[in-house]
């Protein structure tokens, strides 16, 4: 799997979208974890709701929020109020029992705001290594901007 490099401004929100095969991953919870070292374990940050029907509901751990659109096959992770300490290697995972399948590896880089409190607008562009592999990001100066998800049936 290629690693997608995503950059975000300190103090703002970074949104990561990992896409997956909705049929293949039907009924599976998704998780966002932080990799400890190059070959180290991936430490769970947050996972979607235990009731798969309710995977579209936002679940949070501190400033990290996850929600899964199981119909579209897109799990969205939002890192709010991005800090320098949030930089690092992460994974989107699909959980089946105790096993975790990696959907996407994401390297998060945190940039200091060069405009110093001025509105950065939509100037930010994600840098990608090799291929985007289904991961996308939205960068917004509005910290409250969230995605709505359709019903899961």
């Amino acid at each position: 799997l290629n690693t997608t490099v995503l950059q975000g401004m300190a103090g703002q929100s970074l949104r990561v979208s990992c896409t997956y095969d909705a049929l293949k991953h039907w009924g599976r919870r998704k998780a966002w974890c932080r990799q400890l070292g190059e070959e180290g374990p991936c430490q769970r940050v947050v996972s979607t709701h235990g009731v798969w029907l309710l995977a579209f509901l936002k679940k949070r751990n501190g400033s990290t929020v996850i929600a899964d659109d199981t119909l579209a096959g897109t799990v969205t992770i939002t890192l709010k109020n991005l800090q320098a300490g949030d930089a690092g290697l992460y994974q989107c995972q699909s959980l089946r029992g105790r096993e975790a399948e990696v959907l996407q590896k994401v390297l998060v880089e945190v940039l200091e705001d060069p405009l110093d409190d001025q509105d950065a607008g939509d100037l930010w562009v994600p840098e990608e290594s090799s291929s985007f592999e289904g991961a996308q990001v939205e960068h917004s100066t509005s910290r409250n901007q969230e995605t709505s998800f359709p019903p899961t049936s």
């Epitope: 709701h49 235990g50 009731v51 029907l53 309710l54 579209f56 509901l57 936002k58 679940k59 949070r60 751990n61 929600a67 969230e146 995605t147 709505s148 998800f149 359709p150 019903p151 899961t152 049936s153």
Partner: antibody
Framework: QVQLVQSGAEVKKPGASVKVSCKAS????????MHWVRQAPGQGLEWMGI????????SYAQKFQGRVTMTRDTSTSTVYMELSSLRSEDTAVYYC?????????????????WGKGTTVTVSS | EIVMTQSPATLSVSPGERATLSCRAS??????LAWYQQKPGQAPRLLIY???TRATGIPARFSGSGSGTEFTLTISSLQSEDFAVYYC????????FGGGTKVEIK
């Protein structure tokens, strides 16, 4: 106003099945999930499962897996909870409760409207 | 499964006094916690959700606080209609209720 009206009390023998209904009114039935929660005499509340009235998808607590079936009839805005292989410890009041809507990604969720409950007595 | 523990099991309070009920989760549930009131022979009634947001129509004397694993429901000045059983519920991962706290007249 939003209301959940449940079926009447039932007395069943061990091994039998019971089907409890919950008729919703005052809101768009297919826009909110429905939970079932039970309460044994003098005991606390126990979550049993959830149904999506729109598509009919369900998710059950592990304890009730294989014994409970939740269904819905969109034409009458009614959800049903059927519990089979009844035993004396299933004697309880069974509640339906409205869960989260899915028109928006919610920050927090809860069970905001409850039926009055249906008493199910299992006795030989 | 996340286990919810409420304390005390019974709280004896005089009308007009403050009541403080505690709820502890076996692991973090963020702020996905609700409080319900239940009177004998009645269904539970939603009081608080999101740990601290009052449900529609709930009087201001009811307030909730806490996040993670420790939560509190406070009734600032108990009225006669507040004597009941109170349950906390986590909705962060599946759904589990605490064992309840009975608030009785002292």
């Amino acid at each position: 106003q939003v209301q959940l009206v449940q079926s009447g009390a039932e007395v069943k023998k061990p091994g039998a099945s019971v089907k409890v209904s919950c008729k919703a009114s005052g809101y768009t039935f297919t826009s909110y999930y429905m939970h079932w929660v039970r309460q044994a005499p003098g005991q606390g509340l126990e979550w049993m499962g959830i149904i999506n009235p729109s598509g009919g998808s369900t998710s059950y607590a592990q304890k009730f897996q294989g014994r409970v079936t939740m269904t819905r009839d969109t034409s009458t805005s009614t959800v049903y909870m059927e519990l089979s292989s009844l035993r004396s410890e299933d004697t309880a009041v069974y509640y339906c409760a409205r869960g989260p809507g899915y028109t928006t990604a919610l920050d927090y969720y809860y069970m905001d409207v409850w039926g009055k409950g249906t008493t199910v007595t299992v006795s030989s | 499964e996340i286990v919810m523990t409420q304390s005390p099991a019974t709280l004896s309070v005089s009308p007009g006094e403050r009541a403080t009920l505690s709820c502890r989760a076996s692991q973090s549930v963020s702020s996905n916690l609700a409080w319900y009131q239940q009177k004998p022979g009645q269904a539970p009634r939603l009081l608080i959700y999101g740990a601290s947001t009052r449900a529609t129509g709930i009087p201001a004397r009811f307030s909730g606080s806490g996040s993670g694993t420790e939560f509190t429901l406070t009734i600032s000045s108990l009225q006669s209609e507040d004597f009941a059983v109170y349950y906390c519920q986590q909705l962060d991962d599946w759904f589990t209720f605490g064992g309840g706290t009975k608030v009785e007249i002292k």
